[in-house]
């Protein structure tokens, strides 16, 4: 490797400590190395060496202290279940190689809760869920034995206990102990042993930490019967006065690097975006620390709950700011959470045990100062009454989630630290700032969101349906006259809104091909709803050969969505849903809304084009304000409109204007963006404030975009807040929550 | 009351084959994976092969792999040992055994069947 | 050649505790496959005593108790009986050749 040339900061040599089939990299100024291996691929014996005072590297010992010569990358390998209870596993091997199967079966009377089939990974997991055969004789149910642990205790009465244990080598992350409780639940969390090459892979880290988060912040009533043995479901009640307190604790110090730091605060960022995106405001406490803590935001700050401005003080931090007192003091940081916490002169304040607090700690996990930081979550547990009485344990007042990022994470700091709740993990390792980053961007937009409109996937991997999940495509098509092409967007379940001119009333329902998420299905259409006020020849005898005023329809189709990734609805005006994606409070009336988007100016838009088969973004300006008057009257150069006296006759009230060359010169639509939602897009949300009806110039004529376009080129669409009424009728039943 | 009765044992020239069968009942055979463990007189207890309960995954020891043939037939909730080039090492005892659990352990046995190879 | 070993004999008078071991490789018992006990008593099929190292199944007399460490494992009798001579075998799964199933030779425990 280009490194045995180089010699490290620090005093050992690099002679010699290659590794078979992979390269190392330098990690702490040359204190200690890290060896990297392909894909697939772990380093053996060990991962990390360090640098010692004797200027050799640490050792390469293996697990049972054997040493080795040479590091060498080995092929990752799957643990085999030790053992599995009331049923059987096959094949049998000592271990499995990637994309290796293995199946559990139940015996009879025993029902197989978890995944039935599981795949060995690239990380060298199991892919699903504990494979668990259980026949509901316990007053709580079979824990499962998740593979590579071991489990004693096999009675699952009220108050039993099973403990778990790890092969010599492994650490074990999760719950040692779990206990029955009240309600057929068991304490703690599910184990799992880690071998040292082990990460998350962005995507387990991003569901198992949302549907925790989620477990916290959706909360409804907890008032839920379960029967004994049933899975509960972490159910809370967050009260609307802001009852949440949420503290990021970000290491700073040497070890973690000033890449690192600034990638960390990006997640942060996105993890502040996706809170405010539930509609909950919480306090934020923001802490960096290195060898002493610096408290940024204080959650007893008026801003404190103010999203957009905590971020513009985690955005202003600068690793810098450490430099130079650069140990890792984690107990410290702690500390500094512990006193936001505490309150002045030990009296608890009105609805202190209301309040959920939430810790969030990225770090390498290496503290080297201060002592041990488990010391302080204890006191942070008795500050909030924590575990002490068994009928109200109150777990559900603080969590304690731990990111671990990079090689030199010591696995079993970061466990002792997080919390430990039934069917939630609170503990990541990931393999470096990148993935930790891909983390918080899936996070952005996991499954318990899907519901939420306007959200996208802006991950650089994603797909065009990713980026604009709402659009539908319509073709509806005519024997012996060819077809229409239309766009539309998602808005329920159940319906999609589109423009009336891309139908006649002759067309049948059969003949309307609908496709969303970039699915090549069609999708089947129940009926095609008209706003009763549109009529396209409804002015031919005043010389307006077509009259596009109320150009809106709604598909309604035969079967409920899936939302996905892919597939998920846009915001509507004047709906609950908008009124939390811009953030607003949930007083906000329709007005406001309609001020928040349409203000009298020129408002920045959007729209989505198919050019070459690739969904793109076009944006644009709707004219709103001065400009509005002589964008309406471009109208007149629209054929057939050349004749009109007063441009209001065609321009009514219901149209919203872009195009043209100023503020900027807006690209236009061609035919088949017609029925495609108009965008305002606001704190990372997609609100669609118009449908796209007509142009004046057909700048697509031969399925090429014309680039040099006159001025008078201008795009009209229907302004929803505008068809409201037919709106809220048509969407009734679709829970859209119309103010 | 669950049983496995083992039949199909007797004499047998060396090179010559013999099919032991293995009748199961009080459980559900098809759930189960299923075991062939011999003793030669006087001798220890020696397994011979498994198989899985659907019958697709067989492991065999070393001194019968080529020449035994493990199988089932769910339907008639019977186990088969198919055995060929028998030698004179091959008498013994031969039972089945019910495998339980994870780590297959042998929960239920036939009582045998004797396989003698001699010419 | 047994691939587990145990002691070919061995005795004790009643109610005393005797242990017979069993040792494995890294193959077997010290790669953590679980041993499991068998009783043979004269004249009939072996019997499971213990299995996955310490556990009975129903209808065996706590008086046995089974235990591993590294690789070996060990059967415990405690208050032996008269009834107790019989042949005992450990086994566990090997990972060696594909994976099979091992047994001990077998120790025969008189009651003096």
């Known amino acids: 490797t280009p490194w045995s040339l180089a010699r490290p900061q620090g005093s050992c040599s690099l002679e010699g400590v290659e590794i078979k089939g992979g390269s190392f990299r330098l990690l702490q100024e040359g204190q200690a190395l890290e060896y990297v291996c392909p894909s697939g691929f772990y380093p053996y014996p060990v991962q990390t060496r360090t640098c010692r005072s004797t200027g050799s590297w640490s050792t390469l010992k293996t697990q049972d202290q054997k040493t080795v010569r040479k590091a060498e990358c080995r092929a990752i390998h799957c643990p085999r279940p030790h053992d599995f209870e009331n049923g059987e596993y096959w094949p049998r091997s000592p271990y499995y190689n990637v994309s290796d199967e293995i199946s559990f079966h139940c015996y009879d009377g025993y029902t197989l809760r978890g995944s039935a089939n599981r795949t060995c990974q690239v990380n060298g997991r199991w892919s699903g869920q504990t494979a668990i055969c259980d026949n509901g004789a316990g007053y709580c149910s079979n824990p499962g034995i998740p593979i590579g642990t071991r489990k004693v205790g096999s009675q699952y009465r009220l108050e039993d206990s099973v403990t778990y244990h790890c092969s010599r080598g492994l650490t074990l992350r999760g719950s040692q102990r779990r206990t029955c409780q009240e309600g057929g639940s068991w304490s703690g969390t599910e184990p799992s042993c880690q071998d040292s090459f082990m990460y998350d892979t962005p995507q387990e880290v991003a569901e198992a930490f949302l549907s925790s988060l989620t477990e916290t912040i959706e909360g409804v009533d907890a008032e839920d019967g379960h029967g004994p043995g049933e899975q509960q479901k972490r159910k809370i009640v967050l009260d609307p006065s802001g009852s949440m307190n949420i503290y990021l604790v970000l290491d700073g110090s040497d070890s973690i690097g000033a890449s690192n730091f600034t990638g960390a605060k990006k997640c942060l960022v996105n993890l502040i975006e996706k809170v405010a995106s539930y509609g909950v405001k919480p306090r934020y406490g923001l802490v960096t620390y290195a060898t002493y803590p610096k408290i940024w935001v204080k959650v007893s700050e008026a801003d404190s709950s103010n999203a957009d401005w905590v971020t513009k003080q985690l955005n202003e931090i600068n690793y810098e700011d450490h430099k130079l007192k650069s140990g890792t003091n984690t107990k410290k940081a702690l500390q500094a959470v512990y006193s936001m916490m505490s309150w002045p002169d030990d009296v608890p304040p009105e609805g202190w045990n209301r309040t959920r607090h939430v810790i969030i700690l990225m770090t390498d996990g290496l503290h080297n100062m201060g002592g041990d930081p488990i010391t302080v979550i204890d006191e942070i547990r008795d500050l909030l009454y924590i575990g002490k009485d068994r009928k109200n344990p109150r777990e559900d007042y603080l969590d304690v989630y731990v990111f671990g990022v990079g090689p030199l994470v010591n696995q079993v700091n970061i466990n002792a630290l997080a919390s430990k709740k039934d069917n939630e993990q609170h503990v990541f390792k990931v393999k470096d700032m990148e993935n930790l980053e891909d983390v918080f961007y899936q996070m952005i937009d996991e499954s318990q969101s899907l519901s939420l409109c306007g959200m996208v996937w802006e991950h650089r991997k994603g797909t065009d349906y990713h980026k604009q999940p709402w659009q539908a495509k319509i073709s509806v098509i005519r024997p012996s006259k060819g077809h229409e092409s239309c766009m539309g967007a998602v808005v329920s379940e159940y319906f999609v809104l589109t423009a009336a001119h891309c139908f006649t009333v002759d067309d049948k329902e059969h003949s309307i091909k609908v496709s969303v998420g970039g699915e090549k299905r069609d999708l089947e259409i129940e009926v095609v709803l008209f706003h009763p006020n549109y009529n396209i020849n409804g002015k031919k005898e005043a010389g307006i050969p077509e009259f596009y005023d109320y150009d809106v329809a709604l598909i309604k189709l035969k079967n409920k969505l899936k939302y996905g990734q892919t597939i998920r609805p846009i915001c509507l005006p004047c709906t609950e849903g908008t009124t939390r994606a811009l953030r607003l409070p949930p007083t906000t009336t329709c007005q406001q809304q309609k001020e928040e988007l349409l203000p009298a100016q020129d408002i920045k838009a959007l729209f989505v084009s198919e050019e070459e088969k690739k969904l793109t973004r076009k944006e644009v300006y709707i004219k709103n304000g001065d400009k509005k008057g002589s964008c309406e009257r471009d109208a007149q150069y629209a054929p057939g409109y050349d004749k009109v006296k007063d441009i209001s006759e065609v321009v009514t009230p219901r149209f919203l204007c872009t195009g043209g060359v100023s503020p900027y010169a807006d690209p236009n639509t061609c035919r088949g963006d017609s029925g495609g939602p108009l965008i305002v897009h606001k704190r990372s949300r997609f609100i669609q404030v118009g449908v796209i009806s007509w142009g004046v110039v057909d700048v697509c004529k031969n399925q090429k975009r014309q680039k040099q376009v006159p001025a008078h080129a201008r795009d009209f669409h229907i302004n929803l807040f505008q068809v409201l009424p037919w709106l809220k009728e048509k969407l009734q039943d679709e829970d859209l929550g119309f103010l | 009351e669950v049983q496995l009765l083992e039949s199909g044992g007797g004499l047998v020239q060396p090179g010559g084959s013999l099919r032991l069968s293995c009748a199961a009942s009080g459980f559900t055979f098809s759930s189960y994976s299923m075991n062939w463990v011999r003793q030669a007189p006087g001798k220890g207890l020696e397994w011979v092969a498994v198989?899985?309960?659907?019958?697709?995954?067989?492991y065999y020891s070393d001194s019968v792999k080529g020449r035994f043939t493990i199988s089932r037939d769910n339907s008639k909730n019977t186990l088969y040992l198919q055995m060929n080039s028998l030698r004179a090492e091959d008498t013994a005892v031969y039972y089945c055994?019910?495998?339980?659990?994870?780590?297959?352990?042998?929960?239920?046995w036939g009582q045998g069947t004797l396989v003698t190879v001699s010419s | 050649q047994s691939v587990l070993t145990q002691p070919p004999s061995a005795s004790g008078t009643p109610g005393q505790r005797v242990t017979i071991s069993c040792t494995g490789s890294s193959s077997n018992i010290g790669a953590g496959y679980d041993v499991h006990w068998y009783q043979q008593l004269p004249g009939t099929a072996p019997k499971l005593l213990i299995y996955d190292n310490n556990k009975r199944p129903s209808g065996v007399p706590d008086r046995f108790s089974g235990s591993n460490s590294g690789t070996s494992a060990s059967l415990a009798i405690s208050g032996l009986r008269s009834e107790d001579e019989a042949d005992y075998y450990c086994a566990a799964w090997d990972d060696r050749l594909n994976g099979r199933v091992v047994f001990g030779g077998g120790t025969k425990l008189t009651v003096l």
């Open positions: 198989i899985s309960y659907d019958g697709r995954f067989i």
């Open positions: 055994a019910r495998s339980y659990g994870g780590n297959l352990a042998m929960d239920v």
